[in-house]
C-alpha cells in the first residue's frame, strides 16, 4: 500500500499556505483528486509528489494516492481542508445527476472542519427542504440525500454558521432521473389507412416514457416529416403527440409511415400503410371452394372475406332454391371485423336438412356498388338399395335400384343359404357393375342408378345380394328366392313379393 | 493500461440532440474524474465538462444550458448528450481521463460528428 | 477565440532547436501550471508535458517546457520529422474553473 506524507488522515491550513504531499510506493504511483487550481506534479523516483505554492479553498478535497501496478489495487488517502474565513464551501459540480432510489451526493466540501456542527442543507432562496428529504452529511464528502425522488431535482445550496449568519454556497443543481425500463411506449393510429383521392386524412403519432428525455418523429417512406409537437404529462407519464392532417390526399401521400421513438435506452418503432385510390371499392371472395359437398346432418359455416372502402351500407345472405323459399335466419349469420377496411361475414348452418342443399348468396353493398359472391352446397347421402325380381324380354332379371350422392357404386354377389347379407365364407360369385344405367341426376339431388342381373334360373337355396357404396357409405339389399316366389331382405326389414 | 472509446452517430440533424458514449476498459470508471473535449475541424481544442462517479458534472459555461453528462458505472461508461445543435457543433468529440495536476494524460481516439439536414 | 495565445505556425529543419510559446493571463497561466499536448495528423492529442516542465513515461527528453509568469514555452531539440504536428498548451483558468487552450502551433519540419 502507497504511503503518503504528511502521514495525517487530515491536512488543515491556511489560503496561500504551500503544501507538498508525497506519495511513496514500491513502483510507480498516482495521485488522484478532484481537478483544482494551482497543483503542479512531479516524480522524484518511486515517489509522486503534488504540490501548490497558493493554497485557495478551491484545493480543498480528498486526495487519494494509488499504486497502478498493485494486483490488490491498495490506496492511500489525505483530505486537505484550505480554510478561508470567506469561503467556507468548495463547491465541486454545477450539477448531479442520479437515478430514483440513488443516493445523491451533492458535493459541497467544508473547507475548516470546525463548521462542520452548523451546516445544513437548503433549497436555493433559502426554501426549506421537501418533506421527507432524508439527508447525511460528511465533510469530506457533502452532503448525501438518501434514496433521492424525482420531485426533490431541485437546486440546493449548503449551508454554514460562521460568526452567528448563515453563509451559502454557490447551487448545485439536482436531476433525478427515472428509471427508464425501456425504449417510449408508441401508439401509431390509425393501423391502416386508405382513402380516395381528394377526401382528408389523419395520422397519429404518440409516444411516453417516465422520463421527459426521448425523441418521437414520424416518417413517410424513410423521409422524416416536419411536424409540430404537442406535448402532456398525465398518469406519471410524459407524452409527446405529432399528428399529420392531409386536407385532400393524393397518391404521392400513399406508402408506409414509421412512428418511431427513442430514449437512451434504444429504439422503439410502428408502421402503418396509407392506400389512396382512384375510387371507392367493395372486393368479396372466400378461401373456401364456392362449391361445397356436405353429409346431411352435419354442419357447415360459409365464410366471406370483404374488403371495403368506404365502409359497407349493406349485406345479407340469401338462399337461391332450389327446395324451398326458406331464407337463412338471422341467428346463424355473423360479421367479424378484421380491421377497418376487412370484414369476414359467416353463415352457419348446422344439421343439414335435405331441403337445405342448393344455392347461397351473400350480397353486400357500399359506394362503389353491390357485389355477390355464391356458395353451391350438396348434400351427400349414404346409398339406399331396393331389389326387385322382373321379367325383361322374357328373361328373369334382377332389377336393383340405389340412390345416394355421390352417384353409387353397385356389386352383386351370389352366396349360399338364406341370409340377411353374404359374408365371405357363403360367397359363390361377384359381379361388379362398373356402368350402372343412371336413373336420375339433378343439381343438389341424389343420384339415382339401377343396375340389372339377368338370371336364367334361381337357385332356391341362395341368397342374392345388391350392394351400393358411395364416398359417405354403403347400402345393400338381399333376395333370396322360395318356391312361392322371390323373398327379399332390405338391410332392417322384410318384404314378400309372390 | 487504461482506454477509452467513443461511440455515437456520425450524423445528427440540426436542433436535435447529439448523443456521445465514452467505455472506459483496462482500469475502472470508480476513480478519476472523466472529461469531455471537442475539436472542430481546422480549428483548436474546447472543454466541454466532467463527471466524477458520483454523478458530479461541471460544465463548461459557455456550453452549460444544453450540456447533460451521466455515467454509467455498471458498464464502465459516462455519456454526453448536447441538446439544440447547430452547424457549428461539428466537431471531432473526445472523451479524455481528468487527473489532478496532469490533466486529459489519457484520450480516446476520437468521433467525428457533424451537424446537418 | 481561444483563451490562451499561441503562434499558428512554427517550422525548423530536421536537428534545429524549435520553441512554441503560449500567453495567458493571472487567471490561468500566471496562477496554474502549463500542460502541452502534441496531436500528429489524423490522431488524439496526446499529453506531453505536465506541470510546467514534467514528461510522462515516454516521452523523449527533447520536449521540455517551462513557464514564466503568465507565459510558457515548449522547446523541441534535435527536431526530427516525426514531430511534425500540432502542439497545444492548455492551463487551468479560475474563472472557468476547469481548463482552457491555445489556439495549437503547426510545426512543419522542413
Known amino acids: 500500500i502507497p504511503v503518503i506524507e504528511p502521514s495525517v488522515p487530515e491536512l488543515v491550513v491556511k489560503p496561500g499556505a504551500t503544501v507538498t504531499l508525497r506519495c511513496v510506493g514500491n513502483g510507480s504511483v498516482e495521485w488522484d483528486g478532484p481537478p483544482s487550481p494551482h497543483w503542479t506534479l512531479y516524480s522524484d523516483g518511486s515517489s509522486s509528489i503534488l504540490s501548490t505554492n497558493n493554497a485557495t479553498f478551491q484545493n480543498t478535497g480528498t486526495y487519494r494516492c494509488t499504486e497502478p501496478g498493485d494486483p490488490l489495487g491498495g490506496s492511500a488517502a489525505i483530505h486537505l481542508y484550505v480554510k478561508d474565513p470567506a469561503r467556507p464551501w468548495n463547491v465541486l459540480a454545477q450539477e448531479v445527476v442520479v437515478f430514483e432510489d440513488q443516493d445523491a451526493l451533492l458535493p459541497c466540501l467544508l473547507t475548516d472542519p470546525v463548521l462542520e456542527a452548523g451546516v445544513s442543507l437548503v433549497r436555493v432562496r433559502g426554501r426549506p427542504l421537501m418533506r421527507h428529504t432524508n439527508y447525511s452529511f460528511s465533510p469530506w464528502h457533502g452532503f448525501t440525500i438518501h434514496r433521492a425522488k424525482f420531485i426533490q431535482s431541485q437546486d440546493y445550496q449548503c449551508s454554514a454558521l460562521m460568526g452567528g449568519r448563515k453563509v451559502m454556497s454557490i447551487s448545485i443543481r439536482l436531476k433525478v432521473q427515472k428509471v427508464i425500463p425501456g425504449p417510449p411506449a408508441l401508439t401509431l393510429v390509425p393501423a391502416e389507412l386508405v382513402r380516395i383521392r381528394g377526401e382528408a386524412a389523419q395520422i397519429v403519432c404518440s409516444a411516453s416514457s417516465v422520463d421527459v428525455n426521448f425523441d418521437v418523429f414520424l416518417q413517410h417512406n424513410n423521409t422524416k416529416l416536419a411536424i409540430p409537437q404537442q406535448s402532456d404529462f398525465h398518469n406519471n407519464r410524459y407524452q409527446k403527440v405529432l399528428t399529420l392532417n392531409l386536407d385532400q390526399v393524393d397518391f404521392q401521400h400513399a406508402g408506409n409511415y414509421s412512428c418511431v421513438a427513442s430514449n437512451v435506452q434504444g429504439k422503439h418503432s410502428t408502421s402503418m400503410f396509407f392506400r389512396v385510390v382512384e375510387s371507392a371499392y367493395l372486393n368479396l371472395s372466400s378461401e373456401q371452394n364456392l362449391i361445397q359437398e356436405v353429409t346431411v346432418g352435419e354442419g357447415l359455416n360459409l365464410k366471406v372475406m370483404v374488403e371495403a372502402y368506404p365502409g359497407l351500407q349493406g349485406f345479407n345472405w340469401t338462399y337461391l332454391g332450389p327446395f324451398s323459399d326458406h331464407q337463412p335466419e338471422p341467428k346463424l349469420a355473423n360479421a367479424t371485423t378484421k380491421d377497418t377496411y376487412r370484414h369476414t361475414f359467416t353463415l352457419s348452418l348446422p344439421r343439414l336438412k335435405p331441403s337445405e342443399a342448393g344455392r347461397y348468396s351473400f350480397l353486400a353493398r357500399n359506394p362503389g356498388g353491390w357485389r355477390a359472391l355464391t356458395f353451391e352446397l350438396t348434400l351427400r347421402y349414404p346409398p339406399e338399395v331396393s331389389v326387385i325380381w322382373t321379367f325383361i324380354n322374357g328373361s328373369g332379371t334382377l332389377l336393383c335400384a340405389a340412390s345416394g350422392y355421390p352417384q353409387p357404386n353397385v356389386t352383386w354377389l351370389q352366396c349360399s343359404g338364406h341370409t340377411d347379407r353374404c359374408d365371405e365364407a357363403q360367397v359363390l360369385q361377384v359381379w361388379d357393375d362398373p356402368y350402372p344405367e343412371v336413373l336420375s341426376q339433378e343439381p343438389f339431388h341424389k343420384v339415382t342408378v339401377q343396375s340389372l342381373l339377368t338370371v336364367e334360373t334361381l337357385e332356391h337355396n341362395q341368397t342374392y345380394e345388391c350392394r351400393a357404396h358411395n364416398s359417405v357409405g354403403s347400402g345393400s339389399w338381399a333376395f333370396i328366392p322360395i318356391s312361392a316366389g322371390a323373398h327379399t331382405h332390405p338391410p332392417d326389414e322384410f318384404l314378400f313379393t309372390p | 493500461q487504461v482506454q477509452l472509446q467513443e461511440s455515437g452517430p456520425g450524423l445528427v440533424k440540426p436542433s436535435e440532440t447529439l448523443s456521445l458514449t465514452c467505455t472506459v476498459s483496462g482500469g475502472s470508471i470508480s476513480s478519476y474524474y472523466w472529461s469531455w473535449i471537442r475539436q472542430p475541424a481546422g480549428k483548436g481544442l474546447e472543454w466541454i465538462g466532467r463527471i466524477y462517479i458520483s454523478g458530479s458534472i461541471y460544465n463548461n459555461p459557455s456550453l452549460k444550458s444544453r450540456v447533460t453528462m451521466s455515467v454509467d458505472t455498471s458498464k464502465n461508461q459516462f455519456s454526453l448528450k448536447l441538446s439544440s445543435v447547430t452547424a457549428a457543433d461539428t466537431a471531432v468529440y473526445y472523451c479524455?481521463?481528468?487527473?489532478?495536476?496532469?490533466?486529459?494524460?489519457?484520450w480516446g481516439q476520437g468521433t467525428m460528428v457533424t451537424v446537418s439536414s | 477565440q481561444s483563451v490562451l495565445t499561441q503562434p499558428p505556425s512554427a517550422s525548423g529543419t530536421p536537428g534545429q532547436r524549435v520553441t512554441i510559446s503560449c500567453s495567458g493571463s493571472?487567471?490561468?497561466?500566471?496562477?496554474?501550471?502549463v500542460n502541452w499536448f502534441q496531436q500528429l495528423p489524423g490522431t488524439a492529442p496526446k499529453l506531453l508535458i505536465y506541470s510546467n516542465n514534467q514528461r510522462p513515461s515516454g516521452v523523449p527528453d527533447r520536449f521540455s517546457g517551462s513557464k514564466s509568469g503568465t507565459s510558457a514555452s515548449l522547446a523541441i531539440s534535435g527536431l526530427q520529422s516525426e514531430d511534425e504536428a500540432d502542439y497545444y498548451c492548455?492551463?487551468?483558468?479560475?474563472?472557468?474553473?476547469?481548463?482552457?487552450f491555445g489556439g495549437g502551433t503547426k510545426l512543419t519540419v522542413l
Open positions: 493571472s487567471s490561468n497561466i500566471g496562477s496554474n501550471s
Open positions: 479524455a481521463r481528468d487527473r489532478v495536476g496532469m490533466t486529459f494524460d489519457i
Open positions: 492548455a492551463a487551468w483558468d479560475d474563472s472557468l474553473n476547469g481548463p482552457v
